[in-house]
Amino acid sequence: MRRGPRSLRGRDAPAPTPCVPAECFDLLVRHCVACGLLRAPRPKPAGASSPAPRTALQPQE
């Protein structure tokens, strides 16, 4: 089996189920999908008026 547990069909889905490590649960499609890793927010430079935008690592294809 390549994938982790699945959710049920239908729009009234149960809570997210565990996925295999390279995946995460997409609430929109109620399914485990390939996921990249979020980077931690970059530290705000001293005196900056707004925080630097957050970014992410691309999913491995």
Epitope: C24, D26, L28, R30, H31, V33, C35, G36, L57, E61
Partner: antibody, heavy 125, light 107 residues
Framework: EVQLVESGGGLVQPGGSLRLSCAAS????????IHWVRQAPGKGLEWVAW????????DYADSVKGRFTISADTSKNTAYLQMNSLRAEDTAVYYC??????????????????WGQGTLVTVSS | DIQMTQSPSSLSASVGDRVTITCRAS??????VAWYQQKPGKAPKLLIY???FLYSGVPSRFSGSGSGTDFTLTISSLQPEDFATYYC?????????FGQGTKVEIK
């Protein structure tokens, strides 16, 4: 390079059918969800349908339910939108898009990151 | 279905201006909001996902904030290439729904 290429649009009479294709390259569609989004001339974006190609789960906008069918062939890395009983209000540019996900505490944080160039569907007599 | 209401529907601004576009969801969508930029005749481009995360390759003058029902896209210093239409989209619950769009025009 990730790419999505739509084809199959054209002019069709009301009540007719069309099949749109979305050929993916640079990634495997079974790893993501694939969505169709349309845009009527001069209007905003409207989501149409999604599929998770790894298991064939689908969902549809109420406006197309029962008339449109989304499918995917993972061996061809291609998604499809079969459009039946077409109406004038279905006239739009149809885009396919990949939904990308990033892991936020086990849950997807994401959006539609790659889109095709769009294919125009015109329903008119 | 969740309605996404954008404001304003259009705005005129000059290069260098700070521009703010807001989006209100009809119910709580947590942080499951993305923002897209679209130019005439082109496909939309992802700018921001999960309300505040900048998508890869997007200039840092774009930023997003908000959670629950109220969300904001800010362009800190408008550039000539930023004149376009911007859409918010919620992806918390199917069907994913878009705002009606905000057209940013040259003053």
């Amino acid at each position: 390079e990730v790419q999505l290429v739509e084809s199959g649009g054209g002019l069709v009479q009301p009540g007719g059918s069309l099949r749109l294709s979305c050929a993916a390259s640079g990634f495997t569609i079974s790893s993501n969800s694939i969505h169709w989004v349309r845009q009527a001339p001069g209007k905003g974006l409207e989501w149409v349908a999604w599929i998770t190609p790894s298991d064939g789960n689908t969902d549809y906008a109420d406006s197309v339910k029962g008339r449109f069918t989304i499918s995917a062939d993972t061996s061809k890395n291609t998604a499809y939108l079969q459009m039946n009983s077409l109406r004038a209000e279905d006239t739009a540019v149809y885009y396919c898009a990949r939904r990308v996900c990033y892991n936020r505490l086990g849950v997807c944080a994401g959006g539609m990151d790659y889109w095709g160039q769009g294919t125009l569907v015109t329903v008119s007599s | 279905d969740i309605q996404m209401t954008q404001s304003p529907s259009s705005l005129s601004a000059s290069v260098g201006d700070r521009v703010t576009i807001t989006c209100r969801a009809s119910q709580d969508v947590s942080t499951a909001v993305a923002w897209y930029q679209q130019k005439p005749g082109k496909a939309p481009k992802l700018l921001i996902y999960s309300a505040s995360f900048l998508y890869s390759g997007v200039p840092s003058r774009f930023s997003g904030s908000g959670s629950g029902t109220d969300f904001t896209l800010t362009i800190s210093s408008l550039q000539p290439e930023d004149f376009a239409t911007y859409y918010c989209q919620q992806s918390r619950i199917t069907p994913p729904t878009f705002g009606q769009g905000t057209k940013v025009e040259i003053k």
